[in-house]
Interface confidence: medium
């Protein structure tokens, strides 16, 4: 971001709109860091934080909650399978360890918006970087999902089923490295920092606002617009295929996996839309004024405990959409509370063949 | 401790020029946008002129523009203030001030001041 | 130019008073930002971001306010306190101080 403010020049309220910068008061400036004075004063933030206050501590506490017994639940079932996992269970065993992780943490969150931040700043640089990487991997993964059933369907290409098992490893490793490269700047830039007009400790970001502005768009980008396109793109052929070929059973079987990405799309939409306009803002396209500003921050908060939900609600779309799941849950809960019984041996009919419960390709397509 | 001494006031007729220093200790002068404030005898408080860290940006009221032209030397953590076309209603003592930093931002109110050198415009 | 007005110029107290400043904005701003300042010194910074109190201020200064109305309040006037009193905005450029309210002994 270029910024033209000439010399001799009186800075008024729409030039030090795009000024805003987010170092610490101690840090030592070098010369080319962002040289200008003096900025509009920090909106107040009564309203919004008074929302925050009261919204985010009783829906992060409720999605803790859910997320961990729903990913838990979808992480046991999938690892409760005798066989090798189909690559289709070994993504989405990924993505329940990435939305378990995210869960983990919103308590800190909770209490970083009920109270303070009381947890210190190496806490809040993992916090803030677990929580990142799981919010990219969420995305990156379901892109894996839907290009792996395009490679199978489209293609007719079975890219993991046929290759060793240690090529969709090496997929979900290189997601997390990814992710991992993505989350450098939460290590390296989030620390708690005591805010004066509030007199509360908070773990936010010190750094320029060209690096907060940079951040923003990569996570629109790679977090939501890039995994989405990929989505859109690899359904649509699928969906194509299946519709030329009128594949009831492979329609059916597709159920969970678009289920799943709309869910994806519904959730995250509203708050990268509410990110996109504060981008806007950062870069002067849109007047940051404080009524905006306010506005801004409230819908952050509604819509990104919306996207949070999303990772509560793969584990009830399994349960809902997925035969399968059901069964198999089913199953696993009867062995946990009687191991020794034999009637454990009588499986309902639609899944004595031991098929992955979320595959599509054509080894199971009864299965959902 | 943070110090901020002005010198270079005195009197000076009507059109002439002055040349006013503030010369800064006690903390890291380059990490800070600075500023020059007046108050004339028995009035308030006028902002006169404000210089970025590095001096990249200076801004100055209406009142002044044209006129006056803030500098600073960072190598010597020295402000300046040049004084142009001089007028009778420019008589003040003229303070120099720091701008805090808060989050970042460098904010338009002032933590520390010097103890001000007068400027007499007057034939 | 956003004008700062306050209100009112001169106050005479005695010590153990209750005192309120009022400091009216032409224009809403967002924060206000109030200054001490004794005879033949500079001014100190004595409240920013409308309600903190800079270092060194006694809790019995307090400052409150939002919009176009701010008031700086003393809960008990004390010999010390009896000075000259400005509010600044930097909302919008250029910087604007009020004409300064002076708190004189009754």
């Known amino acids: 971001m270029v910024l033209e403010v000439s010399d001799h020049q009186v800075l008024n309220d729409a030039e030090v709109a795009a000024l805003l910068e987010n170092f610490s008061s101690s840090y030592d400036y070098g010369e080319n860091e962002s040289d200008s004075c003096c900025t509009s004063p920090p909106c107040p933030q009564d309203f919004s934080l008074n929302f925050d206050r009261a919204f985010l501590p009783a829906l992060y506490s409720l999605l803790f909650l859910l997320g961990l017994l729903g990913n838990g639940a979808v992480a046991a079932v999938l690892l409760s399978r005798r066989t090798a996992l189909s690559s289709t269970d070994t993504f989405l065993l990924h993505l329940a360890v990435a939305d378990t992780l995210l869960v983990l943490t919103l308590p800190l969150w909770a209490v970083d918006a009920a109270v303070q931040w009381v947890f210190g700043s190496g806490l809040c640089k993992v916090a803030g970087a677990l929580f990142n990487i799981n919010f990219y991997a969420g995305a990156l993964l379901l892109a894996c999902i839907s290009f792996d059933r395009y490679l199978n369907i489209v293609h007719a290409t079975q890219l993991y089923r046929r290759g060793p098992p240690a090529r969709v490893t090496l997929t979900c490793l290189a997601v997390w490295g990814l992710c991992l490269l993505f989350a450098l700047p939460d290590f390296i830039f989030l620390s708690a920092h005591h805010d004066e007009r509030l007199n509360a400790t908070h773990c936010q970001y010190n750094f320029p606002q060209v690096g907060r502005t940079a951040l923003r768009v990569l996570q629109l980008v790679a977090g939501f617009l890039l995994p989405l396109l990929v989505m859109a793109y690899c359904y649509a052929h699928i969906l194509a295929v299946l519709l030329v070929s009128r594949g009831q059973r492979r329609l059916r079987a597709m159920r969970l996996v678009v289920v799943v990405v709309v869910a994806f799309a519904l959730c995250w939409t509203p708050y990268h839309l509410v990110v996109l306009v504060d981008i806007l803002m950062d870069l002067g396209a849109l007047a940051r004024n404080c009524g905006r500003e306010s506005r801004v921050d409230v819908a952050k908060s509604v819509t990104s405990g919306l996207g949070y939900m999303h990772c509560c609600l793969n584990p009830l779309l399994y349960a809902f959409v997925g035969v399968k799941f059901r069964e198999r849950m089913w199953m696993l809960l009867l062995r946990l509370g009687c191991p020794n019984q034999r009637g454990l041996q009588r499986q309902p009919s639609s899944s004595r063949r031991d098929s992955s419960w979320s595959e599509t390709s054509e080894a199971s397509y009864s299965g959902l | 401790e943070v110090q901020l001494l002005e010198s270079g006031g005195g009197l000076v007729q009507p059109g002439g020029s002055l040349r006013l220093s503030c010369a800064a200790s006690g903390f890291t002068f380059t990490s800070y946008a600075m500023s020059w404030v007046r108050q004339a005898p028995g009035k308030g408080l006028e902002w006169v002129a404000t210089i970025s860290r590095g001096g990249t940006y200076t801004y100055y009221p209406d009142s002044v523009k044209g006129r006056f032209t803030i500098s600073r030397d960072n190598a010597k953590n020295t402000l300046y203030l040049q004084m142009n076309s001089l007028r009778a209603e420019d008589t003040a003592v003229y303070y120099c001030?720091?701008?805090?930093?808060?989050?970042?931002?460098?904010?338009?109110?002032?933590?520390?001041w010097g103890q001000g050198t007068l400027v007499t415009v007057s034939s | 130019d956003i004008q700062l007005t306050q209100s009112p110029s001169f106050l005479s107290a005695s010590v153990g008073d209750r005192v309120t400043i009022t400091c009216r904005a032409s224009?809403?701003?967002?924060?206000l930002y109030w200054y001490q300042q004794k005879p033949g010194k500079a001014p100190k910074l004595w409240i920013y971001f409308t309600s903190t109190l800079a270092s060194g201020v006694p809790s019995r200064f307090s400052g409150s306010g939002s919009g176009n109305e701010y008031t700086l309040t003393i809960s008990s006037l004390q010999p010390e306190d009896f000075a000259t009193y400005y509010c600044q905005q930097f909302t919008s450029s250029p910087y604007t101080f009020g004409q300064g309210t002076k708190l004189e002994i009754k």
């Open positions: 224009s809403g701003v967002n924060y």
């Open positions: 001030a720091r701008h805090p930093i808060y989050s970042g931002q460098y904010q338009g109110y002032f933590d520390y």
